[in-house]
């Protein structure tokens, strides 16, 4: 694994090929999670930020930007969207959490919580995922669509199997995250596919 502290994945072009596979040995279904990362893009169209598919299950967990100021979370093919007033283009720190028992999903944008939404109460997110940055999967690890591809930079990505309390979300935003047990930017197992470059993080 690699400590990517102070670095980002740069996706320099629109494509149907360029992506990063994130590798985790996640063995049991997720009842809760929190995902945080930083992103910087000047795309005004829709694009995928984090695509998590399992065998035979598309959009099992997907973080998707619909347009400026609109973020969507898919859980088991169901979707909620939260809105925020944001500058464009501008760097953003995104956290999203979901809790199976209540179905509550919550986005935090730059350390500020958005309106909570609910979906898939009682559902468990399947384990053994293929996780892709840069493209939106329509199959297990593939079937990409250029029009949903990400162009820009992503870094500081962490994923926990719990709903983090607000103070820990703010710690992540401020650059001092808790140790993460699903994906950890400081100990990341990944595979670069296509034209993706690792560069220093210069926009925080």
């Amino acid at each position: 694994h690699t400590d990517l502290s102070g670095k980002v994945f740069v996706f320099p072009r629109e494509s149907v090929t360029d992506h990063v596979n994130l590798i985790t040995p996640l063995e049991k279904p997720l009842q809760n999670f929190t995902l945080c990362f930083r992103a910087y893009s000047d795309l005004s169209r829709a694009y995928s930020l984090f695509s998590y598919n399992t065998q035979g299950r598309d959009n099992e967990l997907l973080v998707y930007k619909e347009r400026v100021g609109e973020y969507s979370l898919y859980i088991g093919r169901h979707k909620v969207t939260s809105k925020v007033i944001e500058k464009f283009p501008a760097p953003v720190h995104i956290c999203v959490s979901w809790e199976s028992s209540s179905g509550i999903a919550e986005f935090w944008i730059n350390g500020t919580p958005l309106v909570k939404k609910g979906l898939r109460q009682g559902y468990f997110v399947e384990a053994q995922p293929k996780i892709v940055l840069g493209q939106e999967q329509d199959s297990y690890g593939g079937k990409f669509d250029r029009s949903q591809s990400f162009v820009g930079e992503i870094g500081d990505l962490y994923m926990w199997d719990s709903v983090l309390p607000p103070e820990n979300i703010l710690s992540a935003y401020q650059g001092t995250p808790l140790p993460a047990n699903i994906l950890d930017w400081q100990a990341l197992n990944y595979e670069i596919r296509g034209y993706v470059i690792i560069k220093p993080l210069v926009w925080v």
């Epitope: 690699t2 502290s5 040995p25 199997d161 808790l178 140790p179 400081q186 100990a187 197992n189």
Partner: antibody, heavy 119, light 107 residues
Framework: QVQLVQSGAEVKKPGSSVKVSCKAS????????MHWVRQAPGQGLEWIGM????????NYNEKFKSRATLTVDKSTSTAYMELSSLRSEDTAVYYC????????????WGQGTLVTVSS | DIQMTQSPSSLSASVGDRVTITCKAS??????VAWYQQKPGKAPKALIY???YRYSGVPSRFSGSGSGTDFTLTISSLQPEDFATYYC?????????FGQGTKLEIK
Amino acid sequence: QVQLVQSGAEVKKPGSSVKVSCKASGYTFTSYWMHWVRQAPGQGLEWIGMIHPNSVNTNYNEKFKSRATLTVDKSTSTAYMELSSLRSEDTAVYYCARRNDYYWYFDVWGQGTLVTVSS
Amino acid sequence: DIQMTQSPSSLSASVGDRVTITCKASQNVNSNVAWYQQKPGKAPKALIYSASYRYSGVPSRFSGSGSGTDFTLTISSLQPEDFATYYCQQCNNYPFTFGQGTKLEIK
């Protein structure tokens, strides 16, 4: 096989410093966080801090932040832990331990280095 | 810092006994707990990670459970080589902290 071999026992005077080494073999040294843990005689385990050999990023237990320094020598696959301003309560066995590939636990440990602080 | 409180601190048992050691965290640590075994004069060895997963090569008589604040390590049928000291460790927050240990002795 994966191994961490530590330097030998040390006897130090109060106020002095000690530098313990931990030589890694059998795996890619620069790919795994190295942690340091100590154990006072007859006591439990206490986490000192961790270092990533490739980025040289560190994270310390606040208790040791002002006195402990973690470093690495990539050319020899060796990690070091230096503790300054030693006092009698620093008498302990100091262990290096490798973080697992995916999870935050320690899957490989050094054999330990006894540091005795005595006037 | 998160306190990890183990109980009992020592325990006498016989070969073949079923033994349970508990560890209580002072705040929620989710499932981010590991268990280690240590024998006198030796370094600790990993037994369990993520509260319930056995480290490779660890016999199936060792099992872990729990989440949140309460965790247990169970040895289903004690073997002579299991007499040692056991430590829990939380890796949910920095600094990582350990329990004070449970010494398992032969009755």
